[in-house]
């Protein structure tokens, strides 16, 4: 009897779908795996026989449920399928957006870029996907644990009238209001300001 | 069952142009994106463009860039491909098709509705 694959999950982020899974012991030799998906009530082989612990669904629609199964493979021995569902609209990671950001006097202006997404066009961004897209920003002073959240109304913002000569970090992350989900924050960039710009008269 | 439809398509000569045009029989082509694809011999199915209703956006495949442009006529319920500067690489059947949830642009699996496609040939 051969075991079936362990611990299968989806790994999902920007709609990057990869079924994943770990080879149970098997003392008779290497395993293989076959992974499917249902499609008009028929599974369709997706990866077939590989030797591999994972299998990139990325070309599924975005849209609906999706059933899908993987199976241990020896000789002419096969062990039962596991099945999983995955609705890759609801279920993938949003992943950290891009950030620019720049120095002017005592501002700091960034721009923010949404995450791109797997097999699309370069154009076509997380952003294109969820209708209420919108960027939560966290910025502080670099060496301090207070942390002060904004959310911008357009991909740029500028944070004005900060302390001359100091280092702020920010970070951005995807949110999505109407789901009240958030996505993954981006690396802190951490930027010095420089002179206050008003002159004393 | 909606029926999309493709015409424009034909024989023209490298460096030239041609208009598609993609219709909806009997129903308005109200869907949030409207893609065009292409199916050169012997080759998969390939995105080529799409159109967002919610905002207008276009989007393209680097292969077209600069050379097709996407457009939709809503008083005539027509979405449109422009192509200039054809080349005999952009041989292939060209189909439009429509999403019921505007979610993706360039890969199949994110289309509901398919036209029966318009055969373009580029050579001298």
């Known amino acids: 009897m051969v075991p079936p694959p362990e611990n299968v999950r989806m790994n999902s982020v920007n709609f990057k779908n990869i079924l994943q899974w770990e080879s149970p012991a098997f003392a008779k030799g290497n395993l293989t795996f076959t992974a499917q998906y249902l499609s008009y009530r028929i599974f369709q082989d997706k990866c077939m026989n590989t030797t591999l612990t994972e299998c990139d669904f990325s070309s599924l629609s975005k849209y609906g449920d999706h059933t899908l199964r993987v199976r241990a493979e020896f000789a002419d021995e096969h062990s039962d399928w596991v099945n999983i569902t995955f609705c890759p609209v609801d279920d993938t990671i949003i992943g950290p957006p891009g950030m620019q950001v720049e120095v002017l006097a005592d501002s700091l202006h960034m721009r923010f870029l949404a995450p791109k997404i797997e097999n699309e066009y370069e154009t076509w961004t997380m952003k294109n996907v969820y209708n209420s897209w919108t960027y939560n920003v966290q910025y502080w002073k670099n060496g301090t644990d207070e942390k002060f959240q904004i959310t911008p109304q357009y991909d740029f913002e500028v944070l004005r009238n900060l302390e001359p000569w100091t280092t702020y970090c920010v970070q951005v992350r995807g949110f999505l209001p109407d789901r009240n989900k958030a996505g993954e924050w981006s690396e802190p960039v951490c930027e010095q300001t420089t002179h206050d710009e008003t002159v004393p008269s | 069952e909606v029926q999309l439809v493709e015409s424009g398509g034909g024989l023209v000569q490298p460096g030239g142009s041609l208009r598609l045009s993609c219709a909806a029989s009997?129903?308005?082509?109200?869907?949030?994106?409207i893609g065009w694809f292409r199916q050169a011999p012997g080759k998969g199915l390939e995105g080529v463009s799409c159109?967002?209703?919610?905002?207008?956006?276009?989007h393209y495949a680097d292969s077209v860039k600069g050379r097709f442009t996407i457009s939709r006529d809503n008083s005539k319920n027509t979405v449109y491909l422009q192509m200039n500067s054809l080349r005999a690489e952009d041989t292939a059947v060209y189909y439009c098709?429509?999403?019921?949830?505007?979610?993706?642009?360039?890969?199949?699996?994110?289309?509901?509705?398919w036209g029966q496609g318009t055969q373009v040939t580029v050579s001298s």
């Open positions: 098709a429509a999403s019921l949830h505007g979610l993706g642009c360039k890969s199949e699996a994110d289309y509901d509705y």
């Open positions: 009997g129903n308005s082509l109200d869907y949030p994106t």
């Open positions: 159109i967002s209703a919610s905002d207008g956006s276009t």
